[in-house]
Amino acid sequence: QDCSAQCQCAAEAAPHCPAGVSLVLDGCGCCRVCAKQLGELCTERDPCDPHKGLFCDFGSPANRKIGVCTAKDGAPCVFGGSVYRSGESFQSSCKYQCTCLDGAVGCVPLCSMDVRLPSPDCPFPRRVKLPGKCCEEWVCDEPKDRTAVGPALAAYRLEDTFGPDPTMMRANCLVQTTEWSACSKTCGMGISTRVTNDNTFCRLEKQSRLCMVRPCEADLEENIKKGKKCIRTPKIAKPVKFELSGCTSVKTYRAKFCGVCTDGRCCTPHRTTTLPVEFKCPDGEIMKKNMMFIKTCACHYNCPGDNDIFESLYYRKMYGDMAHHHHHH
């Protein structure tokens, strides 16, 4: 890598550098190379981008062969095809305010990344992009005719907004039920929710059910057949008892769980049903909880962040089990 050897360039033609990267002579004055950028490793032969005020910092002792491209004080920045002076602030888009400092660009978001938890005034909050607005804003997914000022969440139908099935109308109530959200846990016991106004007072309420996509202790990858990349619905060898906060299900269940993939896909429930499960606690108390039971799973690349209940609420819906007056088929 030093300059004592004879000039030898890898290719006759000059290399094609990415946008914003300078084409420079190497440190030996031999070959044209793409300049190394801020933070990249550099050598005498692989110099840093001089047009951005970068130098190869070999550290101390300075006799090392490999350094890191570092910005000189006051070095400018190249960002999005424009050059900014050190200390200069600019808006890269309506969502970010950026500053150039000694060759490095730092940006801060201008849009709030706030989370909104459900409440009587906003039972099913969602972030949406509104026309003419840069930042996403919270909307509350309520019927248009909700009382104008308070949290009385009656969904009485005043206008033909939803095109309802007449069989779903009850005493001037437009019955609406969302699909169940994805399970809040990718393994072990979690919670799945939905919103409905299918109740005596036609009030929007959030329903929840327990769910288990797969047990955490199962090593499902072992069961994937040779040449296959996924196991969609592995057979569970023996009936299981569910556990919930120290309480155990009274009955045993031969439940279906979703498998795993080795190719980056994730397997999630596709068709589900809801059944009541009785749990017996150490103090003798019996409690009945609705629980999701998996009928079929699907393997796909739409894999949001694990165990992010807010993400799972809105992006990974489950199909089936949309019955309005009964909880299982």
Partner: antibody
């Protein structure tokens, strides 16, 4: 950054009206409701009332006759007025954002004494 | 008058699991009560941990989970840390008003 800040007189005379303001930054009071809560010395929390994002109000029934909560959306401020105060109204008063009571002010101590 | 009851105090060892409950005097707690859990650490401001029964705030660690258990709202802490020592309040919504519980003082031993 979301912030709520209560302000108002620390001392109020009995039978007078207690007026507090909650100044909000980092979110809009037309998007989130604001609650008022108080805590007597060494005691638990007591919910007093709320002004919802659309301007409607709900009050603790025990305070219905003497409590008024209103808001000035242009200033992003919520005001709290409790009339005919007595020594029993001596407490720390908080405002908090609707939606899980996620953000709270630091509280303002109010003493009712002549 | 509706009364919301919490355990006045609970003690747990670091790494252990503890469940705080919130009982309503007028029947079972449901999702329509939008159970909220609020934490106050000594010398710090209140902050919400859980809203709408089971939804965590962005700063709430995964070891905190909200649920309905046996007709009560519950806050379960798994793998308790020393910094979880605090006062915890629940609040339930009753159609026109909220009611706070009396609070639970959680002590972490050690």
């Amino acid at each position: 950054e979301v912030q709520l800040q209560e302000s108002g007189p620390g001392l109020v005379k009995p039978s007078q009206t207690l007026s507090l303001t909650c100044t909000v930054s980092g979110f809009s009071i037309s998007t989130f409701g604001v609650h008022w809560i108080r805590q007597h010395p060494g005691k638990g929390l007591e919910w007093l009332g709320v002004i919802w994002r659309r301007g409607g109000t709900d009050y603790n029934a025990a305070f219905m006759s003497r409590l008024t909560i209103s808001k000035d959306t242009s200033k992003n401020q919520v005001s709290f007025k409790l009339s005919s105060v007595t020594a029993a109204d001596t407490a720390v008063y908080y405002c908090a954002r609707d939606g899980g009571f996620d953000y709270w002010g630091q509280g303002t101590t109010v003493t009712v004494s002549s | 008058e509706t009364v919301v009851t919490q355990e006045p105090s609970l003690t747990v060892s670091p790494g252990g699991t503890v469940t705080l409950t919130c009982r309503s005097s007028i029947g079972a707690v449901t999702t329509s009560n939008y159970a909220n859990w609020v934490q106050q650490k000594p010398g710090q401001a209140f902050r919400g941990l859980i809203g709408g029964t089971s939804n965590r705030a962005p700063w709430t660690p995964a070891r905190f989970s909200g649920s309905l258990l046996g007709g009560k709202a519950a806050l379960t802490l798994s793998g308790v840390q020393p910094e979880d020592e605090a006062e915890y309040y629940c609040a339930l919504w009753y159609s026109t008003h909220y009611v706070f519980g009396g609070g639970t003082k959680l002590t972490v031993l050690g």
